[in-house]
Interface confidence: medium
């Protein structure tokens, strides 16, 4: 099935900004929202954002979760508010590494 | 067995400098998150700093920010805290933490949480004229 | 940052007692992220409990936690004469991390 091509006039979307990209700012708008999590040095680093450009989301959303990163992307006014993305996890549960929100 | 060792402390005028040395043991020191924690005399815990396995990602408490710097050497097995422009109130214990960030086999994380399983004894740090 | 309020600041309990400490986070933090300690006059803090519920290994069954949300709780179902100390909850829900002010069990 051939992937969806973006309309000519795209609909933008009010996004949750959180993370170093954002500046001053507690929101974005832009195409796509985003919620992120990545381990950096032993780290949890949190990031919610927005695609400006369809092309910018269209292989980070599909991106399946790894163990080092995970991307949510949704579509819709403040859709990513209440999304936390979550790593695979595997087998018995250990201690996890330290969480940062980089705001 | 399982040990953290602070070093360093002492008695030091306002304005002045200390580094403070913990040294790990027991562990595979690399694999590890390290925390600074503080205790003034009489008071309660206070978070002061916390650094990365391979030290490149730190972060610090408000109260410290610009003045302390965490760093850490895997080779030697130790943590360090370099405390410049010292205040009567960064007198404190001093402890240095261990965060078990314990990871799968597979590479799979868990997540998130986390809080610090190994305490050294302390260093008192005085900061007096 | 997110306060966290420890009650009672201190209590005076007989060895056999159950005794219960509250602490309170100023917004909302996921169980995984409250943490109790213990120390002792003189010493490092012990860990107790992770993950707001989770006994750390090496920890008498007679300690516990509960909670969510805003609200949790450390028990001592009987108190032991070893038991005798400040205990500190710990939030890591978002750096930088914050700790309790302690509350100071002693002897009646």
């Known amino acids: 099935m051939e992937d969806e091509k973006p309309k000519v006039n795209p609909k933008l979307y009010m996004c949750v900004c959180e993370g170093l990209s954002c500046g001053n700012e507690d929101h974005c708008e832009g195409q796509q929202c985003f919620s992120s999590l990545s381990i950096n040095d032993g780290f949890h680093v949190y990031q919610k954002g927005c695609f400006q450009v369809y092309e910018q989301g269209k292989m980070t959303c599909k991106t399946p979760p790894s163990p080092g990163q995970a991307v949510e992307c949704c579509q819709g006014d403040w859709c990513n508010r209440n999304i936390t993305a979550q790593l695979p996890t595997k087998g018995k549960s250990f201690p996890g590494t330290q969480n940062f929100h980089l705001e | 067995e399982v040990q953290l060792l602070e070093s360093g402390g002492g008695l030091v005028q306002p304005g002045g400098s200390l580094r403070l040395s913990c040294a790990a043991s027991?562990?595979?020191?690399?694999?590890?998150?390290m925390h600074w924690v503080r205790q003034a005399p009489g008071k309660g815990l206070e978070w002061v700093s916390v650094?990365?396995?391979?030290?490149?990602?730190?972060y610090y408490a408000d109260s410290v920010k610009g003045r302390f710097t965490i760093s850490r050497d895997n080779s030697k097995n130790t943590l360090y805290l370099q405390m410049n422009s010292l205040r009567a109130e960064d007198t404190a214990v001093y402890y240095c933490?261990?965060?078990?960030?314990?990871?799968?086999?597979?590479?799979?994380?868990?997540?998130?949480?986390?809080?610090?399983?190994?305490w050294g004894q302390g260093t008192l740090v005085t900061v007096s004229s | 940052d997110i306060q966290m309020t420890q009650s009672p600041s201190s209590l005076s309990a007989s060895v056999g007692d159950r005794v219960t400490i509250t602490c309170r986070a100023s917004?909302?933090?996921?169980?995984?992220?409250l943490t109790w300690y213990q120390q002792k006059p003189g010493k490092a803090p012990k860990l107790l409990i992770y993950?707001?519920?989770n006994l750390q290994s090496g920890v008498p069954s007679r300690f516990s936690g509960s909670g969510s949300g805003t609200d949790f709780t450390l028990t001592i179902s009987s108190l032991q004469p070893e038991d005798f100390a400040t205990y500190y909850c710990?939030?890591?829900?978002?750096?930088?991390?914050?700790f309790g002010q302690g509350t100071k069990v002693e002897i009646k």
């Open positions: 933490a261990r965060e078990p960030g314990y990871y799968y086999p597979s590479g799979y994380y868990r997540g998130p949480g986390y809080w610090m399983d190994v």
């Open positions: 027991g562990f595979t020191f690399g694999r590890f998150v």
């Open positions: 650094i990365g396995y391979s030290g490149s990602s730190t």
């Open positions: 917004q909302g933090i996921s169980g995984n992220w």
């Open positions: 993950d707001a519920s």
């Open positions: 710990h939030q890591s829900y978002r750096g930088p991390m914050t």
